[in-house]
């Protein structure tokens, strides 16, 4: 689609005569008829296939034609066409004398023709005017012409339709050849695809408008390149969404179980050596002179009762000293000068001669020990209490005071926190050394699965055409609220598409 434009510039008819040679009375009141048609090797009469146009009376005899494009648009003359410009044409320009005001062909005498010119040739679409001058024996016509494309038409033949737009169907202007030129921030064949923020992760991010970076579920950060760890992950990281890969020294589903209590809490005192023995469990190996679960108690060197055979122990700065009873000697009063005749066995112990009476041995009754049955048995010396339990002597017996979470005679049994079914809504209970943990079914969360959480059905962006997605909490399904002009359960069907829609 385009326009053939003809600009009449000057017409010379000095003698004021008609084509027949007869003079006009009083002068030649001149108007023009223009016929534009397809290329003919010899321009002949017939239909003006590309169009016709007539002017009003422009002057008398000889005159210049004023450029009137700004005023009424009469000069240049406009011959619009609604087809692909073929590149060739034939043009007939007739100058006529108007005796009266009626310029219709049937109202004019046949000899009112002043002059007629016919040209044909090639003409490319362009802004430049071609100047031409045609001279006959009596007249001269100077004019120029060109072919330009109509608004929104482009290309060598004005055949390429392109209308700039900035809406859902595209964001572009048109180049001189009719190709699209995307507006800043848009790309794609029809400039419908926004260019996301520079660096926005190709898979994990997307955008609905330029320079935006929206993250897909499970990703975060300005460029959507940081994964979101599992909700509740304490001492862990992720490399893909919803992971919880534990830092060194931590365990459990949420990496909140302390596997390295020694490093994280340094529980052993007085230079003791700490050994991890499970989640939140440890053992302290005390240096000489210290005792207690955490080696927090300082031992007197006499506390280990080093003096035998009833010897009494005295603490000294550089150690200890044993004061031996009569009949004994040695560093720990371990050597005897007694025999059974001296009744050396205390607390009802029985004496047995050895080495032909040179020595003896005492057989002690229950609850007593020592070479002379002089010591009460300390039932705690063998550390019988497990899991850090504290041993207490109670007369002839002993008992273990257990740490929280343990029970049994020797604190050997875990207290089962799961026995009372603490996990709600079908959650699975796991016994841990420092408590319990619930694994919740889909749709529930919280420490005891007591919180109902909706499965976000909208997370997968199921709706088309920028429809708004809502999650139906009662059914955990999505509902798409369609914008005007779209239907379907996911708003996937446009009701109508304009003819210029870029499919």
């Amino acid at each position: 689609s385009g326009v053939f434009q003809l600009q009449l510039q000057e017409f010379i008819n000095e003698r004021g005569v008609l084509a027949s040679g007869r003079p006009c009375e009083p002068g030649c009141r001149t108007f023009f008829r223009v016929c534009l048609k397809h290329f003919q090797a010899v321009v002949s009469p017939g239909p003006c296939t590309f169009g016709t146009v007539s002017t009003p009376v422009l002057g008398t005899n000889s005159f210049a034609v004023r450029d009137d494009s700004s005023g009424g648009g009469r000069n240049p003359l406009q011959l619009p066409f609604n087809f692909t410009w073929p590149g060739t044409f034939s043009l007939i320009i007739e100058a006529w004398h108007a005796p009266g005001d009626d310029l219709r062909p049937e109202a004019l005498p046949p000899d009112a023709l002043i002059s007629k010119i016919a040209i044909q040739g090639s003409l490319a679409v362009g802004q430049n005017w071609l100047l031409d001058e045609q001279t006959s024996t009596l007249t001269r016509l100077r004019y120029s012409y060109r072919v330009i494309c109509s608004d929104n038409y482009y290309g060598d033949n004005c055949s390429r339709l392109c209308k700039k737009r900035n809406d859902h169907f595209g964001h572009y202007v048109c180049q001189p050849d009719g190709n699209l030129s995307c507006l800043p921030g848009w790309t794609g064949e029809y400039c419908q695809q926004p260019i996301c923020l520079s660096g926005c992760h190709e898979q994990n991010g997307y955008c609905s408008k330029p320079a935006e970076c929206l993250c897909r579920p499970g990703w975060q950060g300005r460029l959507c390149n940081e994964c979101i760890p599992h909700n509740g992950c304490r001492h862990g990281t992720c490399s893909t969404p919803w992971q919880c890969t534990c830092d060194e020294g931590w365990g459990g589903l949420f990496c909140d179980q302390d596997l390295n209590y020694c490093t994280h809490h340094s529980p052993c005192k007085n230079g003791a050596t700490c050994s991890n023995s499970g989640q939140r469990s440890y053992t302290c190996t005390c240096r000489p002179g210290y005792t207690g679960v955490d080696c927090e108690l300082e031992l007197s060197e006499c506390d280990s009762n080093p003096c035998r055979n009833g010897g009494s122990c005295k603490d000294q700065e550089d150690g200890y000293h044993c004061l031996c009873p009569p009949g004994y000697y040695g560093l720990h009063c371990e050597h005897s000068t007694l025999s059974c005749a001296d009744s050396p066995c205390f607390n009802g112990g029985s004496c047995r001669e050895r080495n032909q009476g040179a020595n003896y041995a005492c057989e002690c009754p229950p609850n007593f020990t020592g070479s002379n049955c002089e010591k009460k048995v300390d039932r705690c010396t063998s550390n019988p209490c497990a899991n850090g339990g504290q041993c207490l002597n109670r007369g002839p017996s002993r008992m273990c005071r257990c740490r929280p979470g343990f029970t049994g005679t020797y604190c050997e049994l875990h207290v089962s926190d799961c026995a009372r079914n603490p996990c709600a809504h079908g959650g699975t209970c796991h016994d841990l050394e420092n408590g319990l943990m619930c694994t919740c079914p889909a749709g529930f969360s919280g420490r005891r699965c007591e919180v109902r959480t909706s499965i976000d059905a909208c997370a997968s962006s199921p709706c088309f055409n920028r429809a708004t997605c809502y999650t139906d909490l009662s059914t955990d399904t999505f509902v798409c609220n369609c914008p005007y002009g779209f239907v379907g359960s996911r708003c996937e069907f446009p009701v109508g598409l304009p003819p210029s829609f870029p499919w």
Partner: nanobody, 119 residues
Framework: EVQLVESGGGLVQAGGSLRLSCAAS????????MGWYRQAPGKQRELVVG???????HYADSAKGRFTISRDDAKNTVYLQMNSLKTEDTAVYYC?????????????WGQGTQVTVSS
Amino acid sequence: EVQLVESGGGLVQAGGSLRLSCAASGSTFSNYAMGWYRQAPGKQRELVVGISSDGSTHYADSAKGRFTISRDDAKNTVYLQMNSLKTEDTAVYYCYVPVKVAGLEYAYWGQGTQVTVSS
């Protein structure tokens, strides 16, 4: 690549019937919506009927009571049964499949099949 091929168009007298078929290839379409559009000369392309992935159907007012959409997922084919045809049903009928991949929307169209209803 996804391809849609329509068939079944032709010349029919007013009041007659036609059955259009759209065969899809290049993917499995059981989870996709499918639809039929038509375009008369000089007019905009308009929805005739669509069937969503959940099986719900959406008819234009002009198609209600006369046209029926159905699908055969085993054959990857959608059908349009057109009864009581009128001269104003004359148009090129296009098959349409909207697809959403990784948040981006794509529209696949067939080449169209001409339906002409004569009086």
